[in-house]
C-alpha cells in the first residue's frame, strides 16, 4: 500500500542533521601494519571562496608502535584556512602554499606540492613511499586521520568508489544532510516521527552509529518516535534529550546505559516502507526524514514538537529573532543524577551559552547549598540527608533554583531521585480485561491480560514496558510479545494504561505442535522515565513471572512451538 506523504525539504530552522562519516566518494586504505613511513594523500574539493578546515592527526599506539614518519599530501582546489593538530607526530606536510594558509604556524616540516593533476600527485607521493591511504573529500569541515590504523583489504592502496575508510579517516561534511518532512495523510493527533536511514557502505564490519537527538521543546509537549534504519551490521547508541519511542534495526542502547543492548526489528529498507512504519506507529507528521552514508555520529536538531510542519521555503520572519535567554529551555537542560545516596545536578555551560543565558547562581531549595563552577559546567551535589531534601517512601525530592541575569525572579524546577531500595515491580496476569482477578495460568487460545505495577507509585515518573517475551523452555522456545515498546505480531495488543498509569497489554497463545509446555516464564523489561527532565534518570528493571499452561482448545493465533 502506498503511503501518501509527500516528502519536501524542511527549513534548517525546523530541523538540521550533521554527521561524521568514514565513507568517501573515492578512497583506499592499505594494510600497513608496521610501516616505517606512512604516506597519506587527501584530495579536498571546496566550493569557491576561502574555507576553514580542522585537520587532526591522531597516533594510535597499537602494539606500542607508530610510524616513524608520516607524509601527508594535501591537495586542495581553492583557498583554505587550515587548523592543524598533530601533537607529537613526526609529520612532513606537502601542500600548495598559495592555497593553504595555517591559522597558526604548523610546527611541522613542510614541502611545496607542485600544481599537478591528481594522477601525478599520486605518483609524486608514491615516489616518497608506498601510499597508505588516499581519499577524495567534498567540502569537509573537519577531518580526523588516525595513524597506525590502516587495515585495508589489500596490502597496497587501490582507489575504490564509495570507499569506507574504516578507522583510518573520519570526516564531517560542512553541508548538513538534506532533511525532508511531510504530513501522513489520514492520521489524527500530533505524534511526530524522525526517520534516519543509514545507507550501506562497502565494509560490512560491525558498526555503532551514535545518534544525538536534540528536540527543542518542553518535555511534556512531545509525542515522538525515532525510527533508525540501517544495514544489519549497524547498531545504535542513542543520546536524546527527550523521551521518545524508539524503533530501530539491529540493536540499540542508550548513552546512559551503553552496556544494555535492546534488540531492534526488521524494518523496511525503502523510504516508502519507512513512511509506512511511521504511519503504523500512529505518527501524523514526519518531522524529519534523512538518508545518510554510513556514519559514525549523527546529530539531529529539530524544533517541531509535534506542531505544524513547515517545509522550505520558510515564511519571512516579521519579528526579530529571539536572542534572549529562554528560562524554560534553560531549566530543561539541568541533568539530574542519582547515585551513592546523593543527588547531583549538572548544567553544561556550553548549552547555557548557546541559549544566550547568563547564570548568576544555581542552588537547591536551601540557598546555602550552592553549585560548584567546574570550568565547563556547574555541578550541584548533596546527600539525601541535607540541603532540604524531602524523602518519601519512593522518592527523594528537591528544587533546583536558578538565578539568571535577564530575570528578576529565580527559576524553579522540581528535581527527583528514585529511592530504588523501596521500589518493587510486579507483573500481574489476569484472565479478563477488567484486571480484577490475578492468575498464574494461561490457556492457549484464550486471551491473557498483563499489567505491570510499581509500588509505591511514583507520580513524577512514567512506567513503560520496553519489552516482554514468554520463555517456554526447550520445546516451546521464546515468544516475543513486545519489542521496543511495541506489540509484536497481531495477537499482541498494547492496551490503555490503568488509571494509575500502569502499562497493560494482552496476548493470545497457540501451539501447532506437541508436546505443549506445561510452564513458562513471562519476562518483561520495564523503564521508569521522568515525565520531565533528562533521560539520565531512567531506570530499567526486568521482572519475571512463572506461568502454568493448561491444555488448549484449537483456536488462537500466536504460533510457536
Amino acid at each position: 500500500e502506498t503511503v501518501h506523504c509527500d516528502l519536501q525539504p524542511v527549513g534548517p530552522e525546523r530541523g538540521e542533521v550533521t554527521y561524521t562519516t568514514s565513507q568517501v566518494s573515492k578512497g583506499c586504505v592499505a594494510q600497513a601494519p608496521n610501516a616505517i613511513l606512512e604516506v597519506h594523500v587527501l584530495f579536498l574539493e571546496f566550493p569557491t571562496g576561502p574555507s576553514q578546515l580542522e585537520l587532526t592527526l591522531q597516533a594510535s599506539k597499537q602494539n606500542g608502535t607508530w610510524p616513524r614518519e608520516v607524509l601527508l599530501v594535501l591537495s586542495v582546489n581553492s583557498s583554505v584556512f587550515l587548523h592543524l593538530q598533530a601533537l607529537g607526530i613526526p609529520l612532513h606536510l606537502a601542500y600548495n602554499s598559495s592555497l593553504v594558509t595555517f591559522q597558526e604556524p604548523p610546527g611541522v616540516n613542510t614541502t611545496e606540492l607542485p600544481s599537478f593533476p591528481k594522477t601525478q600527485i599520486l605518483e609524486w607521493a608514491a615516489e616518497r613511499g608506498p601510499i597508505t591511504s588516499a581519499a577524495e573529500l567534498n567540502d569537509p569541515q573537519s577531518i580526523l586521520l588516525r595513524l597506525g590504523q590502516a587495515q585495508g583489504s589489500l596490502s597496497f592502496c587501490m582507489l575504490e568508489a564509495s570507499q569506507d575508510m574504516g578507522r583510518t579517516l573520519e570526516w564531517r561534511p560542512r553541508t548538513p544532510a538534506l532533511v525532508r518532512g511531510c504530513h501522513l495523510e489520514g492520521v489524527a493527533g500530533h505524534k511526530e516521527a524522525h526517520i534516519l536511514r543509514v545507507l550501506p557502505g562497502h565494509s560490512a564490519g560491525p558498526r555503532t552509529v551514535t545518534v544525538k537527538v536534540e528536540l527543542s521543546c518542553a518535555p511534556g509537549d512531545l509525542d515522538a518516535v525515532l525510527i533508525l534504519q540501517g544495514p544489519p551490521y549497524v547498531s545504535w547508541l542513542i543520546d536524546a534529550n527527550h523521551n521518545m519511542q524508539i524503533w530501530t534495526t539491529g540493536e540499540y542502547s542508550f548513552k546512559i546505559f551503553p552496556e544494555k543492548n535492546i534488540r531492534g526489528f526488521k524494518l523496511p529498507d525503502t523510504p516508502q516502507g519507512l513512511l509506512g512504519e511511521a504511519r503504523m506507529l500512529n505518527a501524523s507528521i514526519v518531522a524529519s526524514f534523512v538518508e545518510l552514508p554510513l556514519a559514525s555520529i549523527v546529530s539531529l536538531h529539530a524544533s517541531s514538537c509535534g506542531g505544524r510542519l513547515q517545509t522550505s521555503p520558510a515564511p519571512i520572519q516579521t519579528t526579530p529573532p529571539k536572542d534572549t535567554c529562554s528560562p524554560e529551555l534553560l531549566m530543561s537542560l539541568i541533568q539530574t543524577k542519582c547515585a551513592d545516596d546523593a543527588m547531583t545536578l549538572v548544567l553544561k555551560k556550553e548549552l547555557v551559552a548557546h541559549l544566550k543565558c547568563t547564570i548568576t547562581g544555581l542552588t537547591f531549595w536551601d540557598p546555602s547549598c550552592e553549585a560548584e563552577d567546574r570550568g565547563d559546567k556547574f555541578v550541584l551535589r548533596s546527600a539525601y540527608s541535607s540541603c532540604g531534601m524531602q524523602v518519601s517512601a519512593s522518592m527523594i525530592s528537591n528544587e533546583a533554583v536558578v538565578n539568571i541575569l535577564s530575570s528578576s525572579s529565580p527559576q524553579r524546577k522540581k528535581v527527583h531521585c528514585l529511592n530504588m531500595d523501596s521500589l518493587s515491580f510486579q507483573l500481574g496476569l489476569y484472565l479478563s480485561p477488567h484486571f480484577l482477578q490475578a492468575s498464574n495460568t494461561i490457556e492457549p487460545g484464550q486471551q491473557s491480560f498483563v499489567q505491570v505495577r510499581v509500588s509505591p507509585s511514583v507520580s513524577e515518573f512514567l512506567l513503560q514496558l520496553d519489552s516482554c517475551h514468554l520463555d517456554l523452555g526447550p520445546e516451546g522456545g521464546t515468544v516475543e510479545l513486545i519489542q521496543g515498546r511495541a506489540a509484536k505480531g497481531n495477537c499482541v495488543s498494547l492496551l490503555s494504561p490503568s488509571p494509575e498509569g500502569d502499562p497493560r497489554f494482552s496476548f493470545l497463545l497457540h501451539f501447532y505442535t506437541v508436546p505443549i509446555p506445561k510452564t513458562g516464564t513471562l519476562s518483561c523489561t520495564v523503564a521508569l522515565r521522568p515525565k520531565t527532565g533528562s533521560q539520565d534518570q531512567e531506570v530499567h528493571r526486568t521482572v519475571f513471572m512463572r506461568l502454568n499452561i493448561i491444555s488448549p482448545d484449537l483456536s488462537g493465533c500466536t504460533s510457536k512451538g
Partner: antibody
Framework: EVQLLESGGGLVQPGGSLRLSCAAS????????MSWVRQAPGKGLEWVST????????YYADSVKGRFTISRDNSKNTLYLQMNSLRAEDTAVYYC????????????WGQGTLVTVSS | NFMLTQPHSVSESPGKTVTFSCTRS????????VQWYQQRPGSSPTTVIY?????PSGVPDRFSGSIDSSSSSASLTISGLKTEDEADYYC??????????FGGGTKLTVL
C-alpha cells in the same frame, strides 16, 4: 621515463617450468604494486597475479593458483613470475604491468614476452 | 564471480561516433571503477579511461567513459573517429573477490 622490459619467455613442454623477469626503471619500484597479465593468441587479456610494493602480499587468479609464484627483488628493480606445471592453456604473451599509484588500473605495460607450452 | 561482457566487434566510418558497452553479469557496475584499455595490433595495451570517466594525460578528449547503474553497464564513446583508433578495446573492473577482471574485448574497425 617509466620502462618495463619482460624476458624469459620461450617454448616449454607441458608440465615444465619457466621463469619470467621484468626489469623496471624510471620510478621508485618498491612503492608500486606490480602485476602479470597474459593474452592467449587471438584472445583477450587475463589478469594472472599481483604483488605488493614490499613483496609481502601476493594475489593470484584461480587458473594459476598453486602453480605460479610472483616475487620481486626491490634492490634489483625486478619482478618475477615462476611458472611450474605448465599447461597448453598457459600459452600466451605475458605482460608485466604497473598498478597506478592508489589507482585501480594498470598505467604502464611492458612489451610482453611469449610463452608457448607445447609438446 | 561475475563476468564482463563486451560485443565482439564494432565498425564505423571516420568522423563518426562509436560507443562500446561492457555489461557486468551480476552485481552492480557502480560498486567500483571501470577502466578501458586500447590495444592496437601488435602493441601492448594502454589506458584510455580509468575510474569510469577519467582520461590519462595524452589521451584526446574524443574518448569519454560513463556508467549506467540501471543496466549495470559501462560505456566507452569515441567521437570524431580516426583510422588510428582501429584497435581492440577492453573494459576492466576490480572486485575484492575476483580481483582484476577484464571483458572479452571489442574489435573496432574504422571503415
Amino acid at each position: 621515463e617509466v620502462q618495463l622490459l619482460e624476458s624469459g619467455g620461450g617454448l616449454v613442454q607441458p608440465g615444465g617450468s619457466l621463469r619470467l623477469s621484468c626489469a623496471a626503471s624510471g620510478f621508485t619500484f618498491s612503492s608500486y604494486a606490480m602485476s602479470w597479465v597474459r593474452q592467449a593468441p587471438g584472445k583477450g587479456l587475463e589478469w594472472v597475479s599481483t604483488i605488493s610494493g614490499g613483496g609481502h602480499s601476493t594475489y593470484y587468479a584461480d587458473s594459476v593458483k598453486g602453480r605460479f609464484t610472483i616475487s620481486r627483488d626491490n634492490s634489483k628493480n625486478t619482478l618475477y613470475l615462476q611458472m611450474n606445471s605448465l599447461r597448453a592453456e598457459d600459452t600466451a604473451v605475458y605482460y608485466c604491468a604497473r598498478i597506478a599509484p592508489a589507482g585501480p588500473h594498470f598505467d604502464y605495460w611492458g612489451q610482453g614476452t611469449l610463452v608457448t607450452v607445447s609438446s | 564471480n561475475f563476468m564482463l561482457t563486451q560485443p565482439h566487434s564494432v565498425s564505423e566510418s571516420p568522423g563518426k561516433t562509436v560507443t562500446f558497452s561492457c555489461t557486468r553479469s551480476s552485481g552492480s557496475i557502480a560498486s567500483n571503477f571501470v577502466q578501458w584499455y586500447q590495444q592496437r595490433p601488435g602493441s601492448s595495451p594502454t589506458t584510455v579511461i580509468y575510474e569510469h570517466n577519467q582520461r590519462p594525460s595524452g589521451v584526446p578528449d574524443r574518448f569519454s567513459g560513463s556508467i549506467d547503474s540501471s543496466s549495470s553497464s559501462a560505456s566507452l564513446t569515441i567521437s570524431g573517429l580516426k583510422t588510428e583508433d582501429e584497435a581492440d578495446y577492453y573494459c576492466q573492473f576490480y572486485d575484492r573477490n575476483s580481483h582484476w577482471v577484464f571483458g572479452g574485448g571489442t574489435k573496432l574497425t574504422v571503415l
